[in-house]
């Protein structure tokens, strides 16, 4: 799978994580920080 950093317009898309652009899938993906989940890493779990 080809990946690259998200475009600058996606700054802030991932609330608690790193934004990755999955080129072949034509979509952005949030790699969440430990303790966070959700499509945009918006949910905290203990």
């Amino acid at each position: 799978v080809s990946i690259t950093k998200c475009n600058s317009d996606m700054n802030g898309y991932c609330l608690h994580g790193q934004c990755i652009y999955l080129v072949d899938m034509s979509q952005n993906y949030c790699r969440c920080e430990v303790g966070y989940t959700g499509v945009r890493c918006e949910h905290f779990y203990l």
Partner: antibody
Framework: QDQLVQSGAEVKKPGASVKVSCKAS????????IQWVRQAPGQGLEWMGR????????KYREKFEGRVTITADTSTNTAYMELSSLRSEDTAVYYC?????????WGQGTLVTVSS | DIQMTQSPSSLSASVGDRVTITCKAS??????IAWYQQKPGQAPRLLIQ???TLQPGVPSRFSGSGSGTDYTFTISSLQPEDIATYYC????????FGGGTKVEIK
Amino acid sequence: QDQLVQSGAEVKKPGASVKVSCKASGFNIKDTRIQWVRQAPGQGLEWMGRIDPLRGNTKYREKFEGRVTITADTSTNTAYMELSSLRSEDTAVYYCVRSGTLFDFWGQGTLVTVSS
Amino acid sequence: DIQMTQSPSSLSASVGDRVTITCKASQDIHKYIAWYQQKPGQAPRLLIQYTSTLQPGVPSRFSGSGSGTDYTFTISSLQPEDIATYYCLQYDNLRTFGGGTKVEIK
């Protein structure tokens, strides 16, 4: 199946406002960003602005600042684009476009006609 | 705002010809360019994103290349069904469309 269903065609008088809706099904708009694009008859595509429904923040093309308002109601999974002070050159098909989780998935378009 | 200058605005070519359209950005867009095909009365159809990544179901005669500020879209062998208007879109910083290229059969 993911869908963006837009409201029906509108006819407005110059100076009036129009509000176009864009209802999402099959996905949560909070996971995406919703862009708005328009196309006047026989003309090219023009990006107007976008909203991040989760955060509520918006970005607009400079030429539309002060005249366009993009909102989202996450409880109904619907985005809206309101354009005020309409003039004849605002006659166009208006599209909502999903971006973020999937690259550029388009609604069917809404024709807005401005005529006296 | 980033400006996108697309050329030519129209072209006429024969079936089987190689067709090339260019888009020049006013600043580096880091390969974040997409190409759309639009036929009359239809919504635009995404062909290519991230400079050269073909969307599923799009024929391999369509291709894209470029980097920095200069990008190219190519139809290697024009077919009658390719008659349409083509647009580039930069999506690095907000969004800007090129002015479009109307492709006709000679």
